[in-house]
């Protein structure tokens, strides 16, 4: 009988397979409490019960059973603030990035039965409870309705709603994607007395139309009002209605600041300050001027007044206002002063305290790093995230500033908690930050924990991904490095994913993964097991991600370098990085590829067509090919207008089509979903046309009826399998 051969544990580990990735075998969990008070929260359990937790009494019980959820096939829920009712959401039907329609049922927790009579219509576009009591506001067929109680008949607040024409309380396509980043455009006042909403009038916006093939004999046409660069934009108006007696005064329009209303403009956000004070943010179409306007209710007038001395202007002289979006204010308890992130004199985004005017703002944070988000302002503390710690732009730590102290003292809440495992955090706070949850995304396994808001003491581990940890024990994961390289006066951070048995003396194929869009960040200290992890683990490919000029959180000089000239430095910096990687000695110069999706598809295409001979092949998924084809709000923010007297010349010079000839010496795989509402198939159609006209050979794949995410299971499997084959062929790797 042969003796058993001892194998060291390392050898028993297997490489990742593509199947692992496609099946989501190694996906992680996070735990975000659904806060309902200072010390209570709800959470949906693994078996779909909605469970109530009280941190202080340690009480927990099922508030809504999975059988009730199941009875209407509910996938989500929302508890009314008076805790008498729960809405149950079912028939989820995705529309665009954030928007979806659904059917809603109201369950009476007191009676233990569904509310009958005056049931909600279907499908509803958006629904929410008032912050107090159990009033309901909802949007149906582009109009807003109000219920004083769930069993009451509805009151119709707006009558102007029309499909693809006028949207009340929900954004149109461009505002949803490029400005609000939400599915809603209505906001309750803190006491539930007022409801503010936006009306978007798209009547004059050009329509993008594309075929949806479905299963029918004839395809149907999807029509979306979609303003491309330079086109007519939505006309926006903001209204506030008194929800106690909405039939008396009706919707009251909030005036637009004069300096904004004098030319094309955008509404950018609304923040309730108190029950009778609201803060609106506006932006000029040329997005370098933002105005924050504080408005007060005048009972005697039945009107909202926005005095000029309550207008605060934020202007950028080197680029656009804000980061990706203009930041929103975090108001103090006094309902007058607020904290806000904007660029300081050195061009780094920092927290400022505004008491009266922006000119007199007090800078709260400073340094050659950036404050990223203000989570919560309480009586004595301000919680924010930044990338200050140890100078890594791709980290996120949570800080607390004690604003009661003079001078304010700063403490990093997360920096030393689990230093190796956790360098990228977000947080979720209870109402007045009495407690908070921390969610760490990496670089190690994600972990969610509960903390005391006064002492920052960890109370409980909510989710630590033990199962995932166990299942990864026998997997050969690649090694991940985050480092920086220097070129001239520039510093570029990069992430390198190295095959498990990486040996610096050997040569490896290199794949660059690029996004590179303005104010984006790819080099982040987060955990991931995805396609590129597999390529490194199983196929022995070195992967690199590089944050070049135009990317975020490293100051405005770096960020605004791409202003009005997209497609230049983003590409140049990827090429610079590739040359530096070659110099490191372990890259096979004959086997270098680049791939990207969306903006990354644009950059990868331009990099392939750079004429440098650095790349053997590359892939562009759903690329932008011309900024004239993309949404006005996005394109114009970074490129200005495509007019002769503005920036038409660079709009024309920066297209992928203009470089068609340069694809002759690379293998190019172009991929796009035909039902892409975001980056229209038109973009790839025009690249293909230009390549054909130039008689350049290339490969292409379309995904019928798939949108910008190519998300359907079958399509994703096909997509990643197809890209894997293409890369392995390019790198001469055997199957």
């Amino acid at each position: 009988r042969p003796s058993r051969v001892y194998k060291p544990e390392g050898n028993t580990k297997r490489a990742l397979t593509l199947k692992d990735i496609l099946n989501g075998t190694f996906s992680y969990k996070t735990y975000f409490p659904n806060w309902i008070s200072e010390q209570e929260y709800l959470h949906q359990s693994e078996d779909d019960n909605i469970v109530f937790y009280n941190i202080e009494t340690r009480e927990s019980y099922i508030i809504l059973s999975n059988s009730t959820m199941k009875s209407v096939n509910a996938t989500d829920y929302g508890l009314s603030p008076d805790r008498q009712f729960v809405y149950l959401e079912s028939d989820y039907s995705k529309l665009w990035r954030y928007s979806y329609t659904a059917t809603y049922y109201i369950y009476d927790l007191q009676n233990g039965e569904f509310v009958r009579g005056y049931e909600l219509p279907r499908p509803i576009q958006y629904l929410c409870w008032s912050p107090v009591g159990s009033k309901l506001a909802y949007v149906y067929q582009n109009n807003i309705y109000l219920k004083q109680r769930p069993g009451d008949p509805p009151f119709q607040i707006t009558y102007t709603g029309r499909e693809n024409r006028i949207f009340n309380g929900i954004p149109d396509w461009v505002y949803e994607e490029e400005m609000l980043a939400t599915k809603y455009a209505l906001w309750w006042s803190p006491d539930g007395k007022f409801l503010a909403y936006v009306e978007f009038n798209d009547s004059d916006i050009p329509i993008i139309a594309y075929s949806y093939y479905g299963d029918g004999q004839y395809p149907r046409t999807i029509n979306i009002p979609y303003p491309k660069a330079g086109a007519k934009n939505p006309v926006v108006r903001v209204f506030i209605v008194d929800t106690t007696y909405p039939h008396h005064v009706g919707p009251m329009e909030v005036p637009v600041p004069e300096m904004i209303a004098s030319s094309d403009y955008y509404f950018s956000w609304l923040t309730w300050v108190s029950s009778e004070r609201v803060c609106l943010q506006w932006l000029k179409r040329v997005q370098n001027v933002s105005v924050l306007s504080i408005c007060d209710f005048r009972e005697d007038w039945h009107a909202w007044e926005c005095p000029k001395n309550q207008e605060h202007v934020e202007e950028s002289r080197t680029g656009w206002a804000g980061g990706f979006f203009v930041s929103t204010p975090a108001f103090s308890q006094d309902a007058t002063s607020y904290y806000k992130i904007f660029s300081d004199k050195d061009g780094y985004k920092h927290i400022h305290y505004i008491k009266d005017t922006v000119e007199n703002a007090i800078q709260i944070t400073s340094g050659k790093w950036e404050a990223i988000y203000i989570f919560r302002v309480t009586q004595d503390s301000l919680f924010y995230s930044s990338n200050e710690f140890e100078g890594y732009p791709g980290r996120r730590n949570i800080y607390r500033i004690s604003i009661g102290n003079s001078p304010p003292s700063k403490k990093c809440v997360t920096c030393h908690l689990r230093k190796e495992r956790c360098q990228y955090y977000t947080a979720s706070f209870s109402y007045k930050a009495k407690y908070y949850a921390l969610v760490c995304y990496g670089p190690g396994l994600p972990i969610s924990t509960l903390h005391d808001g006064r002492t920052d003491q960890e109370i409980q581990v909510l989710e630590e991904n033990k199962e995932l940890e166990n299942s990864l024990r026998n997997i050969q994961l690649p090694k991940v490095e985050i480092k920086k390289l220097k070129d001239g006066g520039l510093t570029f951070w990069y992430k390198m994913i190295l095959p498990p048995q990486f040996d610096r003396s050997k040569k490896y194929p290199l794949l660059i993964q690029v996004y590179g869009g303005p104010c984006s960040q790819s080099v982040k200290s987060v955990f991931a097991v995805n396609w590129i992890t597999y390529l490194a683990s199983k196929e022995g490919i070195v992967i690199a991600l590089v944050d070049g000029r135009g990317t975020a959180f490293q100051g405005d000089k770096f960020l605004h370098a791409v202003y009005r000239k997209l497609g230049v430095y983003e590409v140049e910096d990827q090429l610079t990085a590739v040359r530096k990687f070659i110099e490191m000695g372990f890259i096979d110069e004959e086997r270098i590829a680049i791939w990207g999706w969306s903006y990354g598809g644009y950059v990868s295409s331009l990099a392939l067509a750079s004429g440098t001979g650095l790349f053997k092949c590359g892939i562009a998924v759903a690329p932008v090919s011309s900024w004239e084809y993309y949404a006005s709000i996005y394109s114009e923010r970074f490129m200005g207008l495509p007019t002769k007297d503005d920036n038409l010349e660079h709009y024309k010079n920066s297209t992928v089509m203009a470089r068609a000839e340069y694809f002759r010496n690379v293998d190019y795989l172009l991929i796009h979903g035909t039902a892409d509402d975001n980056v229209h198939f038109q973009n790839s159609a025009q690249i293909a046309k230009a390549l054909v006209n130039a008689q350049v050979d290339f490969q292409a794949m379309w995904y019928s009826d798939q949108n910008h995410g190519i998300l359907s299971g079958r399509s994703q499997n096909h997509l990643y399998t197809h890209m894997t084959h293409f890369l392995k062929q390019c790198f001469s790797l055997s199957d």
Epitope: F155, Q156, T244, H247, H248, P251, E253, H302, A303
Partner: antibody, heavy 117, light 108 residues
Framework: EVQLLESGGGLVQPGGSLRLSCAAS????????MSWVRQAPGKGLEWVSA????????YYADSVKGRFTISRDNSKNTLYLQMNSLRAEDTAVYYC??????????WGQGTLVTVSS | EIVLTQSPGTLSLSPGERATLSCRAS???????LAWYQQKPGQAPRLLIY???SRATGIPDRFSGSGSGTDFTLTISRLEPEDFAVYYC?????????FGQGTKVEIK
């Protein structure tokens, strides 16, 4: 306190037109939603039309839709009701009232419109 | 449209007596949207009650409103001589806003 004063009523033949005005005192007229309510002789009250504040959205009773037009001139603090294709059944006292669809808290004294041949 | 039916059509009472006026809706009305008006001959209507139970400015506390859903009531606890008039209920729940046909409170 808001004061409302209607004018423009009178005798008109069927098919004819009339324009009613309602002058409002108070500097914040532009923010008020306003309505026209009528009362046929010896009968009850009937809502005719409404216009929202600065938004200027308009609403009509089915009985007058397509014939009557409500409008406002906020610079003149005045509400109007343009009545075309008048019928005998439009004979009534026309009141302007402050309010959108209800809680009509201020009313004018009314102006009589008589449609007769 | 929502039809409001008031009863009785006429109520004959003496000063000092209690008057109870009823208003029934053809479909449910949230109490927020129900109002009562008083109208005297040759005068414009006057808002008495809004939100089914809240008194308008300057309205004496002998006037009170109650009810929900489809049944609403206006009560005048002790009739004063100036209270003899026609009373209308009105809903603003739905367009078109509608009024009841009125209840006449007359001196017995």
């Amino acid at each position: 306190e808001v004061q409302l004063l209607e004018s423009g009523g009178g005798l008109v033949q069927p098919g004819g037109s009339l324009r009613l005005s309602c002058a409002a005192s108070g500097s914040t007229f532009s923010s008020y939603a306003m309505s026209w309510v009528r009362q046929a002789p010896g009968k009850g009250l009937e809502w005719v039309s409404a216009i929202s504040g600065s938004a200027g959205y308009t609403y009509y009773a089915d009985s007058v839709k397509g014939r009557f037009t409500i409008s406002r001139d906020n610079s003149k603090n005045t509400l109007y009701l343009q009545m075309n294709s008048l019928r005998a059944e439009d004979t009534a006292v026309y009141y302007c009232a402050k309010g959108w669809f209800g809680n009509f808290d201020y009313w004018g004294q009314g102006t009589l419109v008589t449609v007769s041949s | 449209e929502i039809v409001l039916t008031q009863s009785p059509g006429t109520l004959s009472l003496s000063p000092g007596e209690r008057a109870t006026l009823s208003c029934r809706a053809s479909q449910s009305v949230s109490s927020s949207y129900l109002a009562w008006y008083q109208q005297k001959p040759g005068q414009a209507p006057r808002l008495l009650i809004y939100g089914a139970s809240s008194r308008a400015t300057g309205i004496p506390d002998r006037f009170s409103g109650s009810g929900s859903g489809t049944d609403f009531t206006l009560t005048i606890s002790r009739l004063e001589p100036e209270d003899f008039a026609v009373y209308y209920c009105q809903q603003g729940q739905q367009i078109p806003p509608t009024f009841g046909q009125g209840t006449k409170v007359e001196i017995k």
